[in-house]
């Protein structure tokens, strides 16, 4: 049974040419996080895998940076970056949890960069920002 919930930074805005951090946090479940996908509409931006660490899609390598934590940093923003972003948590045994963030990239300097919450850095093991492996092998 899926008991977890995903908190996200919600609706956010940023200035053209600037950068923004997209963050999600999965709570209320003991499920093992095996992978987190970041997607923009149906385009894959990045993956953070428990075994492999981060993989950034080649077409976004210049403008996407992993972290902090399981979050994603978008750089050199353009107006075309406006839209929906999804964090997709693959977990065992619960299954897939999805969080939604809407980003608006503004021409002017009235963008607010504040996020609703800070992800606690202690939530994730390992220095290389891999998802928590939980108890390891499951059988």
């Amino acid at each position: 049974m899926m008991t977890g919930t995903i908190e996200t930074t919600g609706n956010i805005s940023a200035e053209k040419g600037g950068s923004i951090i997209l963050q999600c946090h999965l709570s209320s479940t003991t499920a093992q996080v095996t992978q987190v996908n970041w997607e923009q509409q149906d385009q894959l931006l990045a993956i953070c895998n428990a075994d492999l660490g981060w993989h950034i899609s080649p077409s976004f390598k210049d403008r996407v940076a992993p972290g902090p934590g399981l979050g994603l940093t978008l750089q050199s923003l353009t107006v075309n970056d406006t839209g929906e972003y999804f964090c997709i948590y693959h977990t065992y045994p619960d299954g897939t949890y999805t969080g939604r963030i809407f980003l608006e990239v503004l021409e002017s300097s009235v963008a607010e960069h504040g996020a609703r919450f800070q992800i606690p850095t202690g939530d994730y093991k390992d220095d290389d920002d891999k998802p928590n492996k939980g108890s390891g092998t499951t059988s």
């Epitope: 095996t34 996908n37 149906d42 428990a50 897939t96 492996k133």
Partner: antibody, heavy 119, light 107 residues
Framework: EVQLVESGGGLVQPGGSLRLSCAAS????????MHWVRQAPGKGLEWVAF????????YYADTVKGRFTISRDNAKNSLYLQMNSLRAEDTAVYYC????????????WGQGTMVTVSS | DIQMTQSPSSLSASVGDRVTITCRAS??????LAWYQQKPGKAPKLLIY???TLQSGVPSRFSGSGSGTDFTLTISSLQPEDFATYYC?????????FGGGTKVEIK
């Protein structure tokens, strides 16, 4: 070109054991999770087991849990399925399949190896 | 476990026909459904994943739609090489489960 080649199938008596192998080539094996899926004669597909790229996550179908063991050797680009306490209902073609990088869908499959459990 | 129910179990169609196969999950699987094609004596081939994303190299006459519990595979204009058995698979949660298959035969 991605290639997956299974071997090790054959005829075995009930209660016996077999070890299946899957040799991978044409891609960076150590980056991908791998599945075993089986298909009984004239029947549909049944997922059997999964192992993540670095072996930290291993899952089994309830029908094989405690009897089958999935493992991999990334240095040898090989996937294995150790099958013990075999039953007649384990008779099937066994396929190894690669998991997509992003989802648990299976994007490349081997040609399969037949396992027959009969006395 | 999530049960996947495909319909119909078989159908007869002609080259050029529009063919629709449905798959229903026993509970919501969001968009996480894959479709496979299997020909006799051959391994399955991935056509579509995440409900509607076409696997690289798959002809555009194949399309997928749906979310939640109800999904559809459509072949817009059936070709001779499309006569095969089609399976759906949920990749939302463990254990990953398949539908029973739909055999597409020549009318």
């Amino acid at each position: 070109e991605v290639q997956l080649v299974e071997s090790g199938g054959g005829l075995v008596q009930p209660g016996g054991s077999l070890r299946l192998s899957c040799a991978a080539s044409g891609f960076t094996f150590s980056n991908f999770g791998m599945h075993w899926v089986r298909q009984a004669p004239g029947k549909g597909l049944e997922w059997v087991a999964f192992i993540s790229s670095g072996s930290s996550s291993i899952y089994y179908a309830d029908t094989v849990k405690g009897r089958f063991t999935i493992s991999r050797d990334n240095a040898k680009n090989s996937l294995y399925l150790q099958m013990n306490s075999l039953r007649a209902e384990d008779t099937a073609v066994y396929y190894c399949a690669r998991m997509r990088l992003d989802y648990y869908a299976m994007d490349y499959w081997g040609q399969g190896t037949m396992v027959t459990v009969s006395s | 476990d999530i049960q996947m129910t495909q319909s119909p179990s078989s159908l007869s169609a002609s080259v050029g026909d529009r063919v629709t196969i449905t798959c229903r999950a026993s509970k919501s699987i969001s968009k996480y459904l894959a479709w496979y094609q299997q020909k006799p004596g051959k391994a399955p081939k991935l056509l579509i994943y995440s409900g509607s994303t076409l696997q690289s190299g798959v002809p555009s006459r194949f399309s997928g739609s749906g979310s939640g519990t109800d999904f559809t595979l459509t072949i817009s204009s059936l070709q001779p090489e499309d006569f095969a058995t089609y399976y759906c698979q949920q990749h939302n949660e463990y254990p990953w489960t398949f539908g029973g298959g739909t055999k597409v035969e020549i009318k």
